[in-house]
């Protein structure tokens, strides 16, 4: 159903990384505009991105209120210049999104190695604790704040002079690894949420090697 000059949105897709969350859809509008509504399963609908010609809507501000809730969005289509017009059933044409639970589904962003420090035959590698847009008591929480021990990091490290890799994991943001004295090492990390079934792993961080700026060496 619907008016003759509007089409329903389709391919509604959640795009979310570290809780920055955007709903995307098709088609590009021709003589129509869209409004998005979002709700938790038990909550009221809240309208966002009013009468837009975009095919995306940033819903981060809504989902960060409770990242463990499950959200549903819907996209309404209206004729351009006549947003009061409704479909044949007396209401605007709309399409529902898939359900989305940010805590379980947001993609893990590419991590960054913040620093590494060598003391003798040990190296401490620190992963940057990225800030998210999730707030508590008026402060933004880090990824570790949100996920706690549910989030682990896998470290890959290898001698600059060789291809054989080693690995370690941590449920903090720090690794303490043994290295051979006098050897330079390279490092890369990956974020993982073991308990998930989807979107479990991040892409690898950029490689950082000893002898570059981020490192520090002490005997």
């Amino acid at each position: 159903s619907g008016t003759t000059n509007t089409v329903a949105a389709y391919n509604l897709t959640w795009k979310s990384t570290n809780f920055k969350t955007i709903l995307e859809w098709e088609p590009k509008p021709v003589n129509q505009v869209y409004t998005v509504q979002i709700s938790t399963k038990s909550g009221d609908w809240k309208s966002k991105c009013f009468y837009t010609t975009d095919t995306e809507c940033d819903l981060t501000d809504e989902i960060v209120k409770d990242v463990k809730q499950t959200y549903l969005a819907r996209v309404f289509s209206y004729p351009a210049g006549n947003v009061e017009s409704t479909g044949s059933a007396g209401e605007p044409l709309y399409e529902n999104s898939p359900e989305f639970t940010p805590y379980l589904e947001t993609n893990l962003g590419q991590p960054t190695i913040q620093s590494f420090e060598q003391v003798g035959t040990k190296v401490n590698v620190t992963v940057e604790d990225e800030r998210t847009l999730v707030r508590r008591n008026n402060t933004f929480l880090s990824l570790r704040d949100v996920f706690g021990k549910d989030l682990i990091y896998t470290l890959y490290y290898w001698k600059s002079s060789s291809s054989g890799k080693k690995t370690a994991k941590t449920n903090t943001n720090e690794f303490l690894i043994d290295v051979d004295k006098g050897e330079n090492y390279c490092f890369s990390v990956q974020a993982v949420i073991p308990s998930r079934t989807v979107n479990r792993k991040s892409t690898d961080s950029p490689v950082e090697c000893m002898g570059q700026e981020k490192g520090e060496f002490r005997e």
Epitope: K166, T197, R200, K201
Partner: antibody, heavy 117, light 107 residues
Framework: EVQLVESGGGLVQPGGSLRLSCAAS????????MHWVRQAPGKGLEWVGW????????IYDPKFQDRFTISADTSKNTAYLQMNSLRAEDTAVYYC??????????WGQGTLVTVSS | DIQMTQSPSSLSASVGDRVTITCKAS??????LSWYQQKPGKAPKLLIY???SLADGVPSRFSGSGSGTDFTLTISSLQPEDFATYYC?????????FGQGTKVEIK
């Protein structure tokens, strides 16, 4: 249902090569780490190595680094263990296992490799 | 590399007994230790991860304790289906290392 099925085992002469396969179903291997573990007859478990199928990163026990190669084909949802220069002491049941990054939650039934002349 | 020393290598016990198996790491591995049960001709099965967390579907008579270098698997009341070989695994850094195994037999 999650399932891992190893194949490719059999009798091989010392110095020979063999490629084992671990076909996964019920999940996407690129979302996990995949390991190979072996067990010689009447002996304990021995870790061989792992692969992250998404990016190809591999980690080996150093004792296997030179002779064994782990790979994966995400389009076939299969991990592989290529074993070269095989010795009698490589005779074992070879298992693949899925790693969540916290634990090995699913294992295959194993495939027996016998190295003998 | 980390060495895992598991003891005892075998033990005899009766149904209903409390059984304790220990694993000692050659250096601090924090809580990166898991326990597996293996029956003859079968693949290992996860029991405990992160030293103390019970895996899904595993009976509550199994428990794990310890951190750092000393770890324990306890079966509070041994059942007939628990007669098997048990392995600890240090899985926090490579190379991952299994203990030598503990065979739990019927007395």
């Amino acid at each position: 249902e999650v399932q891992l099925v190893e194949s490719g085992g059999g009798l091989v002469q010392p110095g020979g090569s063999l490629r084992l396969s671990c076909a996964a179903s019920g999940f996407n291997i690129k979302d996990y780490y995949m390991h190979w573990v072996r067990q010689a007859p009447g002996k304990g478990l021995e870790w061989v190595g792992w692969i992250d199928p998404e990016n190809g990163n591999t980690i080996y026990d150093p004792k296997f680094q030179d002779r064994f190669t782990i790979s994966a084909d995400t389009s076939k949802n299969t991990a592989y263990l290529q074993m070269n220069s095989l010795r009698a002491e490589d005779t074992a049941v070879y298992y693949c296992a899925r790693d969540t990054a916290a634990y090995f939650d699913y294992w295959g039934q194993g495939t027996l490799v016998t190295v003998s002349s | 590399d980390i060495q895992m020393t598991q003891s005892p290598s075998s033990l005899s016990a009766s149904v209903g007994d409390r059984v304790t198996i220990t694993c000692k790491a050659s250096r601090d591995i924090k809580s990166y230790l898991s326990w597996y049960q293996q029956k003859p001709g079968k693949a290992p099965k996860l029991l405990i991860y992160y030293a103390t967390s019970l895996a899904d579907g595993v009976p509550s008579r199994f428990s794990g304790s310890g951190s750092g270098t000393d770890f324990t698997l306890t079966i509070s009341s041994l059942q007939p289906e628990d007669f098997a070989t048990y392995y600890c695994l240090s899985d926090g850094s490579s190379p991952f290392t299994f203990g030598q195994g503990t065979k739990v037999e019927i007395k």
